[in-house]
Interface confidence: low
Amino acid sequence: MEKSIWLLACLAWVLPTGSFVRTKIDTTENLLNTEVHSSPAQRWSMQVPPEVSAEAGDAAVLPCTFTHPHRHYDGPLTAIWRAGEPYAGPQVFRCAAARGSELCQTALSLHGRFRLLGNPRRNDLSLRVERLALADDRRYFCRVEFAGDVHDRYESRHGVRLHVTAAPRIVNISVLPSPAHAFRALCTAEGEPPPALAWSGPALGNSLAAVRSPREGHGHLVTAELPALTHDGRYTCTAANSLGRSEASVYLFRFHGASGASTVALLLGALGFKALLLLGVLAARAARRRPEHLDTPDTPPRSQAQESNYENLSQMNPRSPPATMCSP
């Protein structure tokens, strides 16, 4: 992996802005065609801005214009946009124009959200992206291919970065059990710029809590943890960035029973009573001297399955009482 990165870095240093990528066949054809089609003043170049910003839900225009050495080229051409990385990234848009045609017929528009605004015959490959989502925040690369009597192609190497901004949205808020019979709360929010998260609740004031860095591959997600919920009541997570704020709450209710010692005594008493009952049943059956095997179940009797995980937790740990919660 490190070697690959080093190799890419070397390539990035060696190749000029906008890379002239040709096959051997293309190269020989170009040596023949350059004299006919090229003017010394013109060469391949691509003009793209370093970044375009737009809000999630809106549309954005990715500008891309180019110059080429093949004056009056009127043959078939293909316009392509890729995402992620040049040359190898997945295509998100592709259109083809027939010889002499100004109409670039769309062959690929990922999810129907990409539309060519520019006219490739007029050296303009500008693209409109509809209904932006945070996942569209990446780098895009324009490319043009000539495929008639001239075989040539050119692709922007640096590309244009589409920066998608979004008001915060809390995607998950939950209460989880933690060691030492306690509960912890987790709040995950998305937004760009990544939102600042704050917890507020009983005896908390306004706590920034432990904020985890955005997860790899999910750069717009931020998680804040409240390690120990010590009081019952409503805990509110607030996510805020320059575009807005969002709130969601969870409620913690613990059913406070008797003291620890009396709880243990009650449990032991209940277990002892059950043991006595079992012995009684066994004794009664033995007294009947029935030849059949004992009809005891393979697994001990269980109480009916609870709907709430927190109720199950409370069964497993009597001193860790149940909690209730709600999602955003």
Epitope: G57, A135, E190
Partner: antibody, heavy 121, light 104 residues
Framework: DVQLQESGPGLVKFSQSLSLTCSVT?????????WNWIRQFPGNKLEWMGY???????NYNPSLKNRISITRDTSKNQFFLKLNSVITEDTATYYC??????????????WGTGTTVTVSS | QIVLTQSPAIMSASLGEEITLICSAS?????MHWYQQKSGTSPKLLIY???NLASGVPSRFSGSGSGTFYSLTISSVEAEDAADYYC???????FGGGTQLEIK
């Protein structure tokens, strides 16, 4: 409470144009959201046709691109569907629908009651 | 274009029964939405973003899934749940073919 109501002729002749109006009450179509047309064919299959955004820009289903146009009249808080060169397969119930976008995804949260259009030959 | 396939096309369920409707996508998607359409009415948003209940939807409905496989579950079917159910994928505006739920 936002409400959408479709109106227009229930019968359109083959090869003519279908024109429908969606009247929106309770929300200004210039304030936000995407304002869509969706149709449901007799076999119950649903097809998204296109939308007009709050800023007036459009997007259409590629399969209808050459025949469809969605416009609006902001003063009346209405948006319109025009489908040219109709064929019998365009017989359907047409719904105008509001689409909400929440930063990650979009979904249709308010639907009109629908209007049935039959294409006669 | 992403194709959404719903199964089964028709499902018959008894009152109180738990049922699951399936929606599979031809390629991976981030979210799925579900709509309910009762006879003679327009579709109604039931579940959005895979698992969130729309306003006024009873808690017996739930949704889950990821990637290419999504499901809608009704924990205890009631008579009023008889309807057609459609899954919907946002980024390419496609709908599934629907599942018709009949109550025995």
């Amino acid at each position: 409470d936002v409400q959408l109501q479709e109106s227009g002729p229930g019968l359109v002749k083959f090869s003519q144009s279908l024109s429908l109006t969606c009247s929106v009450t309770g929300y200004s179509i210039t304030s936000g959201y995407y304002w869509n047309w969706i149709r449901q064919f007799p076999g119950n299959k649903l097809e998204w046709m296109g939308y007009i955004r709050h800023d007036g820009s459009n997007n259409y289903n590629p399969s209808l691109k050459n025949r469809i146009s969605i416009t609006r009249d902001t003063s009346k808080n209405q948006f319109f569907l025009k489908l040219n060169s109709v064929i019998t397969e365009d017989t359907a119930t047409y719904y105008c629908v509001r689409e909400i976008y929440d930063g990650s995804s979009g979904y249709f949260d308010v639907w009109g009651t629908g209007t049935t259009v039959t294409v006669s030959s | 274009q992403i194709v959404l396939t719903q199964s089964p096309a028709i499902m018959s369920a008894s009152l109180g029964e738990e049922i699951t409707l399936i929606c599979s996508a031809s390629s991976s998607v981030s979210y799925m939405h579900w709509y309910q359409q009762k006879s003679g009415t327009s579709p109604k948003l039931l579940i959005y973003r895979t698992s969130n209940l729309a306003s006024g939807v009873p808690s017996r409905f739930s949704g889950s899934g990821s990637g290419t496989f999504y499901s809608l579950t009704i924990s205890s079917v009631e008579a009023e749940d008889a309807a057609d159910y459609y899954c919907h994928q946002w980024s390419s505006w496609t709908f599934g073919g629907g599942t018709q739920l009949e109550i025995k």
